[in-house]
């Protein structure tokens, strides 16, 4: 009698066990479905954009290479102007090259002239550097002009053809990036 | 709607490393970023790591070279691999999920760096 529970309880064990990994395989499965249905979207808003506006890059933003970009229209301080990129899946502009650097002014000077845009550049408080959002250096020909007198956190913004430095306090427009999506055709 | 549940804050020494963890269920094709905050007493919360689902990223200048923010491969849970901790990096670390319209917050964990 005893043995015969002892096998009913191994045996209720097994099912048991059975039914974990049946359970850990939905959750994976589900997890995947999640995914694959976030990518699905993506590709269907990318489609119908496309069809749209034949663009890799949302509506009112301007493609230039792989990037994307948005020149706001509104002002913030640079705190506020990065989370309002990032609320749109985009992070502050990056300008990697005088190429780059020549495109967004170029584009700037068409839409709105010379204003003031805050890019993804700050200051280190202790060491004095300039650093891009991602923590990389900007290349030499692309660090701010001038030194901001301020006691405060000091970013970087450009207007015309310069980058230039002020306290991050300061409300100005702002630009966003962000890859533009490859066409698959 | 979004929910986040952070974990793996807790007590650490000066120069050791910490990694905590968000994971984000429900409306999570809303979101169009995540990112890490933290608030230390009588301080304003601020911005620590942020990364796009594009995969770009972004740091405060305090904790660039030292913090990593990393997502999984399913992109439903953010990670932050804070190495070489500081006592000035004591706050309680909260997440947040960007989306167009709302933004969604965590309940915060504790992370304490002290000897």
């Known amino acids: 009698k005893l043995l015969q529970v002892s096998t009913i309880a191994m045996q209720q064990q097994e099912k048991l066990i059975q039914q974990e990994r049946a359970l850990l395989n939905f959750t994976e499965w589900k997890r995947s479905c999640a995914l694959q249905m976030k990518y699905c979207q993506a590709f269907m808003q990318n489609s119908l954009s496309s069809a749209h506006n034949s663009s890799p890059c949302p509506n009112n933003w301007i493609q230039n290479r792989e990037s994307c970009y948005y020149v706001s229209e509104i002002w913030s301080i640079w705190h506020t102007s990065q989370e309002n990129c990032l609320k749109e899946g985009s992070t502050l502009l990056q300008i990697e090259s005088k190429e780059e650097m020549d495109f967004i002014t170029g584009s700037l000077r068409k839409i709105k002239g010379s204003y003031d845009y805050w890019v993804g550049l700050s200051q280190d408080g202790h060491s004095g550097r300039w650093l891009w959002q991602d923590g990389s250096s900007p290349s030499p020909g692309l660090l701010p002009a001038e030194r901001s007198q301020s006691a405060n956190q000091v970013c970087g913004y450009v207007k015309s053809n310069s980058l230039l430095s002020s306290n991050c306090s300061t409300w100005k427009y702002f630009i966003c990036e962000k890859y533009a999506l490859r066409s698959s055709v | 709607q979004v929910q986040l549940q952070e974990s793996g804050g807790g007590l650490v020494q000066p120069g050791e490393s910490l990694r905590l963890s968000c994971a984000a269920s429900?409306?999570?094709?809303?979101?169009?970023?995540m990112g890490w905050y933290r608030q230390a007493p009588g301080k304003q919360r601020e911005l620590v790591a942020a990364i796009t689902d594009g995969g770009a990223k972004t740091y405060a200048d305090s904790v660039k070279g030292r913090f990593t923010i990393s997502t999984d491969n399913a992109g439903n849970t953010v990670y932050l691999q804070m190495d070489s901790l500081r006592p000035e990096d004591t706050a309680v670390y909260y997440c947040?999920?960007?989306?167009?319209?709302?933004?969604?917050w965590g309940q915060g964990t504790q992370v304490t760096v002290s000897s």
């Open positions: 429900g409306s999570i094709f809303s979101i169009n970023a």
């Open positions: 947040k999920a960007f989306t167009r319209g709302n933004d969604y």
